[in-house]
Interface confidence: medium
C-alpha cells in the first residue's frame, strides 16, 4: 500500500437494471485491475421529487477525478443523474450532493436496496 492512499479492494454493488444486465441486484464487488492502476468505487443515483433512486454502485477504474476522495460526493450543479467516485473499501456505501459554489444540505443515501 502507498502511504497516505486508501486502497480500494471492494465496493458496494447495486444495479437497478440487474435483470437485463444479468448481474446480482446488490452485494459486494471485488475490484480488479492492473497493479499499476488505482481502483475506485462509484455511485450513481437520481433525485425524483426528493426521493433518492439508486441507479448503480460498484467498482470504477483508475480515474484522476476520484483520486484521494475518501467520500463519494457529487459536486455538479443539478445533474440529471448524479455520479460520484471515491477511494477506499466500500466508500460508495454513502454518497452525498454538495454542488460547488452553493450551500446545500447533502443528500445522504437513506435507501437500503431490497434483495432480488
Amino acid at each position: 500500500a502507498i502511504l497516505g492512499r486508501s486502497e480500494t479492494q471492494e465496493c458496494l454493488f447495486f444495479n437497478a437494471n440487474w435483470e437485463k444486465d444479468r448481474t446480482n441486484q446488490t452485494g459486494v464487488e471485488p475490484c480488479y485491475g492492473d497493479k499499476d492502476k488505482r481502483r475506485h468505487c462509484f455511485a450513481t443515483w437520481k433525485n425524483i421529487s426528493g426521493s433518492i433512486e439508486i441507479v448503480k454502485q460498484g467498482c470504477w477504474l483508475d480515474d484522476i477525478n476520484c483520486y484521494d476522495r475518501t467520500d463519494c460526493v457529487e459536486k455538479k450543479d443539478s445533474p440529471e443523474v448524479y455520479f460520484c467516485c471515491c477511494e477506499g473499501n466500500m466508500c460508495n456505501e454513502k454518497f452525498s450532493y454538495f454542488p460547488e459554489m452553493e450551500v446545500t444540505q447533502p443528500t445522504s443515501n437513506p435507501v437500503t436496496p431490497k434483495p432480488p
Epitope: D21, R22, Y32, T44, N65
Partner: antibody, heavy 120, light 107 residues
Framework: EVQLLESGGGLVQPGGSLRLSCAAS????????MNWVRQAPGKGLEWVAG????????SYADSVKGRFTISRDNSKNTLYLQMNSLRAEDTAVYYC?????????????WGQGTLVTVSS | DIQMTQSPSSLSASVGDRVTITCRAS??????VNWYQQKPGKAPKLVIY???SRASGVPSRFSGSGSGTDFTLTISSLQPEDFATYYC?????????FGGGTKVEIK
C-alpha cells in the same frame, strides 16, 4: 505482458458450427470478465457476448442469442465461443477482449482476431 | 438498447491539425463511454475510458470530454501514427454498443 490469442476461425457453410478459442496470458485470467466482439468486412464493431470472471453470468447480443454460447475454463486460461446455426451475416473477424468488471467498464486489451467466413 | 451516434463518419486532416470527433448517446450514460483506435488489419486499442481517462501508454495529445449524452475525443496535434478509425462505446448497460466509427484520413 497481457496477451490474447484467438483461434478456431475458418470457412463454414450456412447452418454449420464452429468453436472459437481465446488463450490468455500475462494476467490473472480468473479475475477478469471477458467478451467477444466482431467486425464484419469493412464494417464497424459489434459486441457479441460477455462472461463474468467465474462464468456465473453470461450475456449476448440479440443477433446471436440462442445460437452462440460463451464459456470459459479458468484452469486453462481460455475463453470459448461456440457458434451454431451460422448465417452469412455472421461472417466477421472475431476478437476476444478483456474487461475489469462484468459491467460498466472498458475493453482494455484485445486479441488479434480470427476470421470466420460463412459461405456455401 | 443504447444507440451511439458518431460524427463525422470520416474526416481529412493534416499532421499538426486539431481533430475533434463527437459521439452522442440515445440516453444519458453518465461517464460510461470509452474510445478506441483501430488501424487497418489490426485489433482496436483502448485510447480513453470513463469519458476522460487516458489508457496506459496513450500520448497526452489524446483527450476525452463530456458526460450524459454528448462526448468528444480530441487529438490536439495530429501525428502520422494517428491516422486510423476511432470508435466510441458505451458501457453503461448491456448490450455494449459502439458508434459507427470515424475514419481520420490524410488530407
Amino acid at each position: 505482458e497481457v496477451q490474447l490469442l484467438e483461434s478456431g476461425g475458418g470457412l463454414v457453410q450456412p447452418g454449420g458450427s464452429l468453436r472459437l478459442s481465446c488463450a490468455a496470458s500475462g494476467f490473472t485470467f480468473s479475475s477478469y470478465s471477458m467478451n467477444w466482439v466482431r467486425q464484419a468486412p469493412g464494417k464497424g464493431l459489434e459486441w457479441v457476448a460477455g462472461i463474468n470472471y467465474n462464468g456465473g453470468y453470461t450475456s449476448y447480443a440479440d443477433s446471436v442469442k440462442g445460437r452462440f454460447t460463451i464459456s470459459r475454463d479458468n484452469s486453462k486460461n481460455t475463453l470459448y465461443l461456440q457458434m451454431n446455426s451460422l448465417r452469412a451475416e455472421d461472417t466477421a473477424v472475431y476478437y476476444c477482449a478483456r474487461s475489469a468488471n462484468w459491467h460498466d467498464t472498458a475493453l482494455d486489451y484485445w486479441g488479434q482476431g480470427t476470421l470466420v467466413t460463412v459461405s456455401s | 438498447d443504447i444507440q451511439m451516434t458518431q460524427s463525422p463518419s470520416s474526416l481529412s486532416a493534416s499532421v499538426g491539425d486539431r481533430v475533434t470527433i463527437t459521439c452522442r448517446a440515445s440516453q444519458s450514460i453518465l461517464s460510461f463511454v470509452n474510445w478506441y483506435q483501430q488501424k487497418p488489419g489490426k485489433a482496436p486499442k483502448l485510447v480513453i475510458y470513463a469519458a476522460t481517462s487516458r489508457a496506459s501508454g496513450v500520448p497526452s495529445r489524446f483527450s476525452g470530454s463530456g458526460s450524459g449524452t454528448d462526448f468528444t475525443l480530441t487529438i490536439s496535434s495530429l501525428q502520422p501514427e494517428d491516422f486510423a478509425t476511432y470508435y466510441c462505446q458505451q458501457s453503461y448497460n448491456l448490450p455494449l454498443t459502439f458508434g459507427g466509427g470515424t475514419k481520420v484520413e490524410i488530407k
